[in-house]
């Protein structure tokens, strides 16, 4: 068997660090056998069999000019093997961040904090952390570790499925190359990394006969579980075309009637979502949707509206039933502060 331990990486390649002494090992001989070393394609002897170094070649303070292929020969001139030297650096701890678009799963992505110049792979795992004792604030790694399955096709991402919202997790991402390994540990809780995807299906419609009103509606993001234990709340922004500043409101449901739109002007509207009890952060904004208030007369039948902003508007007072709320039942963890029977909307 070869006297040369095979480092992780392609066969026939040995590794070293620039500025450091590097030992190359002749793979096809017995340990200690004296050999001669040459650079591939060069007749000049680099190190003879009488060096006292046996099957090894020592390069003091290696630099980029030392990279390449080396040939070792036994005393009888037989080929002991060829070795390719590649220089690089040991791994540094990768940079890791984790995010969750729902309350059941989270993903972690990583980047090298320093390029090693060598073949590199990543080992990803996680543990669930538990509190020690009912009154203790100390936490210790307990269950696991379990692998954090990596995306196929080499994307620097792994996903933890079926996570517990109230638990803490310790993520381990280890960068490995032929010169060593380096580990980044990251403590995460779903509550703090939760960031929903933006709401979908945003529509902005005029309200016939009301020149200062726009009705916006949207749906939960598709990534949010269909039967959510946890509701989302929303933030809506709108502004007339060419107007730099956004107006912001927090709707109670999945629609909002804007009552202070500028008559005759198109308005941009966008929405964002967040966990109902303020876990994590607001989503990014949805793509903007546009709508222009109507210019016609007041219709005989009034459409249904959700919660309204009662800004003065030169229009008659009309009573209108509100639409039903989305059938999303709250989890016992939260008490929905909205009235269970919505009040009749009053248009002022």
């Amino acid at each position: 068997s070869s006297p040369c331990p095979q480092a992780w990486g392609p066969p026939g390649v040995q590794y070293g660090q620039p500025g450091r002494s590097v030992k190359l090992c002749c793979p096809g001989v017995t340990a200690g056998d004296p050999v001669s070393w040459f650079r591939d394609g060069e007749p000049k002897l680099l190190q003879g069999p009488d060096s006292g170094l046996g099957h090894e070649l020592v390069l003091a303070q290696a630099d980029s000019t030392d990279e390449g292929t080396y040939i070792c020969q036994t005393l009888d001139g037989a080929l002991g093997g060829t070795v390719t030297l590649q220089l690089g650096y040991p791994p540094a701890r990768p940079v890791v961040s984790c995010q969750a678009a729902d309350y059941e799963n989270f993903s972690c992505t990583w980047s090298p904090s320093q390029i090693s110049g060598l073949p590199t792979r990543y080992l990803t795992s996680y543990r669930k952390k538990t509190v020690l004792g009912a009154d203790s604030q100390r936490r210790s790694p307990s269950t696991g570790p379990w692998p954090c399955p990596q995306d196929p096709l080499g994307a620097a991402r792994c996903v933890v499925h079926g996570a517990e919202f109230w638990s803490q997790y310790r993520i381990n991402v280890t960068e490995v190359n032929p010169l060593g390994a380096s580990t980044r540990l990251l403590d995460v809780s779903l509550q703090s990394i939760l960031r929903p995807d933006p709401p979908q299906g945003l529509r902005v419609e005029s309200v016939p006969g009301y020149p200062r009103r726009l009705r916006a509606s949207w749906t939960y993001p598709a990534s949010w579980p269909c039967q959510p234990h946890f509701l989302l709340k929303f933030r809506l922004q709108y502004r007339p075309a060419q107007h730099p500043a956004w107006s912001t409101v927090e709707p109670a449901g999945l629609e909002e009637v804007i009552t202070d739109a500028v008559a005759g002007l198109p308005h941009a509207v966008r929405v964002s979502a967040r966990d109902f009890l303020d876990a994590g952060t607001w989503s990014t904004w949805s793509p903007e949707a546009w709508g222009t208030p109507s210019t016609g007369t007041i219709p005989k039948e009034i459409p249904a509206w959700g919660q309204l902003h009662t800004q003065p508007e030169v229009e008659p007072q009309v009573d209108s039933p509100a639409p039903p709320r989305p059938s999303l039942q709250p989890h016992p963890r939260l008490l929905d502060h909205r009235d269970s029977v919505e009040q009749v909307a009053v248009l002022a």
Epitope: A92, R93, V95, V96, S97, T109, W110, S111, P112, S113, Q114, I115, G117, S182
Partner: antibody
Framework: EVQLLESGGGLVQPGGSLRLSCAAS????????MTWVRQAPGKGLEWVSS????????QYADSVKGRFTISRDNSKNTLYLQMNSLRAEDTAVYYC???????????WGRGTLVTVSS | DIQMTQSPSSLSASVGDRVTITCQAS??????LNWYQQKPGKAPKLLIY???NLQTGVPSRFSGSGSGTDFTFTISSLQPEDIATYYC?????????FGPGTKVDIK
């Protein structure tokens, strides 16, 4: 010679913007994370922001989050810091630094002074 | 964020004296602690990394020790050129933090 050279500092009014640059030479810039560290007059050192070699991960101090943006152009061996909504408390010498393993700063520039005042 | 405290905030010593500065982290940072020297009007210079490793080219009179939350920086024999402010800095997590500094001058 291995060095970092900051530029772009100056006097700016509160609420204004400034873009700092850091030109790197003498090492393989695209292999290393890069960092901005600042020092207010007569005060200590404060880490501001860091970016990985690919630019794919960035990190910010809470004091600048949402106002400052770190970026890099590996083809130009240059690091940037876009500073918006500047405040008086952002007045400082801003240093560009090359870390090993994200946080061991083994190479520093000379710094560039940013003064935020009306 | 991890808080770093240093003591003393300043000290005066004679040339040849042994000088010791301590640094404490608000939580365990393993050995991810560096020490820097900064002279007036100059950029900081890395002296010690990973608690106890001497940066290349730094005189051997500088040393560091410690692990976890408590760390010590020592100048075995103070020299006139060592007049400076010394900072500890952790990088256990992705938001590095510096200590407030210790100003060292000559008696």
């Amino acid at each position: 010679e291995v060095q970092l050279l900051e530029s772009g500092g100056g006097l700016v009014q509160p609420g204004g913007s400034l873009r700092l640059s850091c030109a790197a030479s003498g090492f393989t810039f695209s292999w290393y994370s890069m960092t901005w560290v600042r020092q207010a007059p007569g005060k200590g050192l404060e880490w501001v922001s860091s970016i990985v070699p690919s630019g794919g991960h960035t990190q910010y101090a809470d004091s600048v989050k949402g106002r400052f943006t770190i970026s890099r152009d590996n083809s130009k061996n240059t690091l940037y810091l876009q500073m918006n909504s500047l405040r008086a408390e952002d007045t400082a010498v801003y240093y560009c630094a090359k870390p090993h393993d994200w946080g061991r700063f083994d190479l520093w520039g000379r710094g560039t002074l940013v003064t935020v005042s009306s | 964020d991890i808080q770093m405290t240093q003591s003393p905030s300043s000290l005066s010593a004679s040339v040849g004296d042994r000088v010791t500065i301590t640094c404490q982290a608000s939580q365990d940072i393993n050995n991810y602690l560096n020490w820097y020297q900064q002279k007036p009007g100059k950029a900081p210079k890395l002296l010690i990394y990973d608690a106890s490793n001497l940066q290349t080219g730094v005189p051997s009179r500088f040393s560091g020790s410690g692990s976890g939350t408590d760390f010590t920086f020592t100048i075995s024999s103070l020299q006139p050129e060592d007049i400076a402010t010394y900072y500890c800095q952790q990088y256990d997590n992705l938001s590095p933090t510096f200590g407030p500094g210790t100003k060292v001058d000559i008696k």
